[in-house]
């Protein structure tokens, strides 16, 4: 089966790589604009130059193109704790990230929030904090993992999942009490 191609892809596929078909004259292939520039005017004829202009401040194109406008630079979302890793240039969008000892939680494909890496108090680091994943903690005896924090088994209620993790500790306490009564 031939994959479905959009009109623009169909038109571009007629021309060699790095060129696109003139929108008003399909016998002409124009050279695409370099990254950092956009299409101001199509080439007037075969072998003639495409009129490409550099993107203005606050906009960019990251690959060769025949876009009529540059793309607007992304802004890092302060409300999500994001910081700017590198500024927008004519050929590269803004790069946003998180501060040191933070990781990204993605709410959707392009939207992330920065959270502090867990310190694993009352436990040990099983897997270190990474760019897109919090620290994975292993809790000491007498503690259970709740929302990636080690919480004392004294806070474990019967209805919670922690009963399985804290049960050996509870049994040990009972066993010690029993042995003391002999």
């Amino acid at each position: 089966l031939v994959p479905h191609l959009g009109d623009r892809e169909k038109r571009d596929s007629v021309c060699p790589q790095g060129k696109y078909i003139h929108p008003q004259n399909n016998s002409i292939c124009c050279t695409k604009c370099h990254k950092g520039t956009y299409l101001y005017n199509d080439c007037p004829g075969p072998g003639q130059d495409t009129d490409c202009r550099e993107c203005e401040s606050g906009s960019f194109t990251a690959s060769e193109n025949h876009l009529r406008h540059c793309l607007s630079c992304s802004k890092c979302r302060k409300e999500m704790g994001q910081v700017e890793i590198s500024s927008c240039t004519v050929d590269r969008d803004t790069v946003c990230g998180c501060r040191k000892n933070q990781y990204r939680h993605y709410w959707s494909e392009n939207l992330f929030q920065c959270f502090n890496c867990s310190l694993c108090l009352n436990g040990t680091v099983h897997l270190s904090c990474q760019e897109k994943q919090n620290t994975v903690c292993t809790c000491h005896a007498g503690f259970f993992l709740r929302e990636n924090e080690c919480v004392s088994c004294s806070n474990c209620k019967k209805s919670l999942e922690c009963t399985k993790l804290c049960l050996p500790q509870i049994e040990n306490v009972k066993g010690t009490e029993d042995s003391g009564t002999t």
Partner: nanobody, 120 residues
Framework: EVQLLESGGGLVQPGGSLRLSCAAS????????MGWVRQAPGKGLEWVSF????????YYADSVKGRFTISRDNSKNTLYLQMNSLRAEDTAVYYC?????????????WGQGTLVTVSS
């Protein structure tokens, strides 16, 4: 068919409280980030609060921090928004949304909204 049905809106005096609910069906609720988005009269959409499936990660807009609390009950496929110390500027239509789907066919994953009016 994806369905998100909000309830709990109404008229409340400044300083009052409301609890919004959103019953979800037609998709695996436990796999998705969920949230509340609002639209005040004549204004654009504003993110209010998000929550991830295990309720570990939450987001609150600065304008509602300390007053609103988001929660979810995965066993009931329901999302909640507890709204305390309500202000006139909280007046808006509140939409329940599958946040994970932002940027795709987002409006397939939104409810019809529930109106919250804060007025004396």
């Amino acid at each position: 068919e994806v369905q998100l049905l909000e309830s709990g809106g109404g008229l409340v005096q400044p300083g009052g409280s409301l609890r919004l609910s959103c019953a979800a069906s037609g998709f695996t609720f436990t796999r998705y980030n969920m949230g509340w988005v609002r639209q005040a009269p004549g204004k654009g959409l504003e993110w209010v609060s998000f929550i991830d499936p295990p309720s570990v990660h939450t987001y609150y807009a600065d304008s509602v921090k300390g007053r609103f609390t988001i929660s979810r009950d995965n066993s009931k496929n329901t999302l909640y928004l507890q709204m305390n110390s309500l202000r006139a500027e909280d007046t808006a239509v509140y939409y329940c949304a599958n946040i994970s789907q932002f940027g795709s066919n987002a409006f397939d994953y939104w409810g019809q909204g529930t109106l919250v009016t804060v007025s004396s």
